[in-house]
């Protein structure tokens, strides 16, 4: 049985050229993470194997840095990067645990962080 | 340039156990991954795990769970594999492969080691 | 553990053919999708990552596309040189997994 939920840092908005730290957080279960993948869309943005290390997509590697932890930092923002993104959590026994995050890239700086949220 | 250079084949009895060796050069061993693959005759290639050479830390696939135990000697840039309770099934070529920095791609090969299982 | 199922398993083409190869997977694995090309007794050689990025020298008569859970994987124009056989892996998550290969022969 899932017990875990996964926190993340919700809709958060940032301004163009800047950077953003993309954060989720698997709580209330015993389950071990084995891997995490970042994804957007139809794309993938990252993996970080707790054995094998990072591997970082090509499309994103001039503008993408593994961490904080299991996190991404997504750099030198264009409003194309606006939209969702993904943090899959493959975890033993448990399975796999998906959370949300839409990002929405400013032209002017007016950004601000949104509230955190859950997903059970 | 990188070279990945594997020890040579190896007949074994089934129940033995079997250590193959892959020596790098060319590289920075601890800034890439390194793997093994295998392929038995006529079959798809199979990955049997991998090991961060940075952290000693490694990934096996489960069918090997148990047999199969990869290390590695960061002093002499060399990386082994040894797979335990051998039976006819696993005869087969083993490569050892690296994966790219920051890339799971495996970039460069081993020559590969056939081992034989045979009573 | 996913399965990545190619197709065809073995096909004949003559020089100068377009060649396609598909590889499904049975769940998502995003485009972390990698091709190799395998010789007869020699090591496979890395050919395309990330389901459609080039490796470094490899000709650009070789290209891959897709991503989910289809792949293809094309020659544009067959040289004699190609023949070989090649497979799909996925990396997305662990046991990696190959495709069964696709045997490709000069008409």
């Known amino acids: 049985m899932m017990t875990g939920t996964i926190e993340t840092t919700g809709n958060i908005s940032a301004e163009k050229g800047g950077s953003i730290i993309l954060q989720c957080h698997l709580s209330s279960t015993t389950a071990q993470v084995t891997q995490v993948n970042w994804e957007q869309q139809d794309q993938l943005l990252a993996i970080c194997n707790a054995d094998l290390g990072w591997h970082i997509s090509p499309s994103f590697k001039d503008r993408v840095a593994p961490g904080p932890g299991l996190g991404l930092t997504l750099q030198s923002l264009t409003v194309n990067d606006t939209g969702e993104y993904f943090c899959i959590y493959h975890t033993y026994p448990d399975g796999t645990y998906t959370g949300r995050i839409f990002l929405e890239v400013l032209e002017s700086s007016v950004a601000e962080h949104g509230a955190r949220f859950q997903i059970p | 340039q990188v070279q990945l250079v594997q020890s040579g084949a190896e007949v074994k009895k089934p129940g033995a156990s079997v250590k193959v060796s892959c020596k790098t050069s060319g590289y920075t061993f601890t800034e890439y991954t390194m793997h093994w693959v295998r392929q038995a005759p006529g079959q798809r290639l199979e990955w049997i795990g991998g090991?961060?050479?940075?952290?000693?830390?490694?990934s096996y696939n489960q069918k090997f769970q148990g047999r199969v135990t990869i290390t590695v000697d960061t002093s002499a840039s060399t990386a082994y594999m040894e797979l335990s309770s051998l039976r006819s099934e696993d005869t087969a070529v083993y490569y050892c492969a690296r994966s790219g920095n920051w890339d799971y791609a495996m970039d460069y090969w081993g020559q590969g080691t056939t081992v034989t299982v045979s009573s | 553990d996913i399965q990545m199922t190619q197709s065809p398993s073995s096909m004949s083409a003559s020089v100068g053919d377009r060649v396609t190869i598909t590889c499904k997977a049975s769940?998502?694995?995003?485009?972390?999708v990698v091709w190799y090309q395998q010789k007869p007794g020699k090591a496979p050689k890395l050919l395309i990552y990330?389901?459609?990025y080039r490796y470094t020298g490899v000709p650009d008569r070789f290209s891959g596309s897709g991503s989910g859970t289809d792949f293809t994987f094309t020659i544009s124009s067959l040289q004699p040189e190609d023949i070989a056989t090649y497979y799909c892996q996925q990396h997305y998550i662990t046991p990696w997994t190959f495709g069964g290969g696709t045997k490709l022969e000069i008409k």
């Open positions: 769940q998502h694995v995003s485009t972390a």
């Open positions: 990330s389901a459609s």
């Open positions: 090991i961060n050479p940075n952290n000693g830390g490694t």
